[in-house]
Interface confidence: low
Amino acid sequence: ELPKPSISSNNSKPVEDKDAVAFTCEPEAQNTTYLWWVNGQSLPVSPRLQLSNGNRTLTLFNVTRNDARAYVCGIQNSVSANRSDPVTLDVLYGPDTPIISPPDSSYLSGANLNLSCHSASNPSPQYSWRINGIPQQHTQVLFIAKITPNNNGTYACFVSNLATGRNNSIVKSITVSASGTSPGLSA
């Protein structure tokens, strides 16, 4: 009877579009066939996937966030078959280009400005804001009460992922009109 196999990895937190990961099915055994599955499905045929070492090692080249799935290895001989517990790959990625919401760019004087910035990233990124180039708080949400036309300008959200070493940003123009002079929306 074959033992329950396990999966070892040479990189537990690979970075998207940069790193490769090699999974190895343990233990090494003679006259044994090694198989692999992803999220309960057979391996897709992909140039980024390579089986080696008698199919005992599965290498993922140039990992992407879509590779963050559950990997299972199986072993089989002429007597029995068994498979490992799943190992979920934690792919570090981002931050992607952030999105500022709501999308409105025109506001009435006296309204509250409540801008939220979001960027897809693993782990979650650090957020910071600049208004007309001047650094503001390091928060995901920027709140300014009772804005006036003095608050016109460019609002930039900056995101940084310390794990991937990557940064991103987006800039949004905000126009504040005196009350009653613009069809713009109040926040």
Epitope: T33, Y34, L35, W36, W37, G40, Q41, S42, L43, P44, V45, N55, C73, G74, Q76, A81, R83
Partner: nanobody, 124 residues
Framework: QLQLVESGGGLVQPGGSLRLSCAVS????????IGWIRQAPGKEREGVSC????????NYADSVKGRFTISRDNAKNTVYLQMNSLKPEDTAVYYC?????????????????RGQGTQVTVSS
């Protein structure tokens, strides 16, 4: 290992149709590619068709392409081989076979386990 039981064979006239079934029992059925192979008297075993564990990938021997269709019903643990436009040269014992595989593809060469077979005879 899986247990395989084929059925659906019989005597049919040229141009006729048959539907073979392969009932599969055992653990981890969805980890196996399933294939049909056939052996005519005095001839080598020939791979006919196969279907991957997910059912997304199929393969056919050139001699049956366009006439045979393989499918699998994972809810019923059954693989089917629909055989149309049968010819006398399709006469053989048809075996269902399995491959415990991690690839979402199938082939005819590596199957090491098969059932007892079902006889298909095409004759007028």
């Amino acid at each position: 290992q899986l247990q395989l039981v084929e059925s659906g064979g019989g005597l049919v006239q040229p141009g006729g149709s048959l539907r073979l079934s392969c009932a599969v029992s055992g653990d981890r059925w969805d980890y196996y590619a399933i294939g049909w192979i056939r052996q005519a008297p005095g001839k080598e075993r020939e791979g006919v068709s196969c279907i991957s564990s997910s059912g997304r990938t199929t393969n056919y021997a050139d001699s049956v392409k366009g006439r045979f269709t393989i499918s699998r019903d994972n809810a019923k643990n059954t693989v089917y081989l629909q055989m149309n436009s049968l010819k006398p040269e399709d006469t053989a014992v048809y075996y269902c076979s399995t491959e415990f595989t991690g690839w979402d593809r199938c082939g005819f060469d590596e199957y090491d386990h098969r059932g007892q077979g079902t006889q298909v005879t095409v004759s007028s």
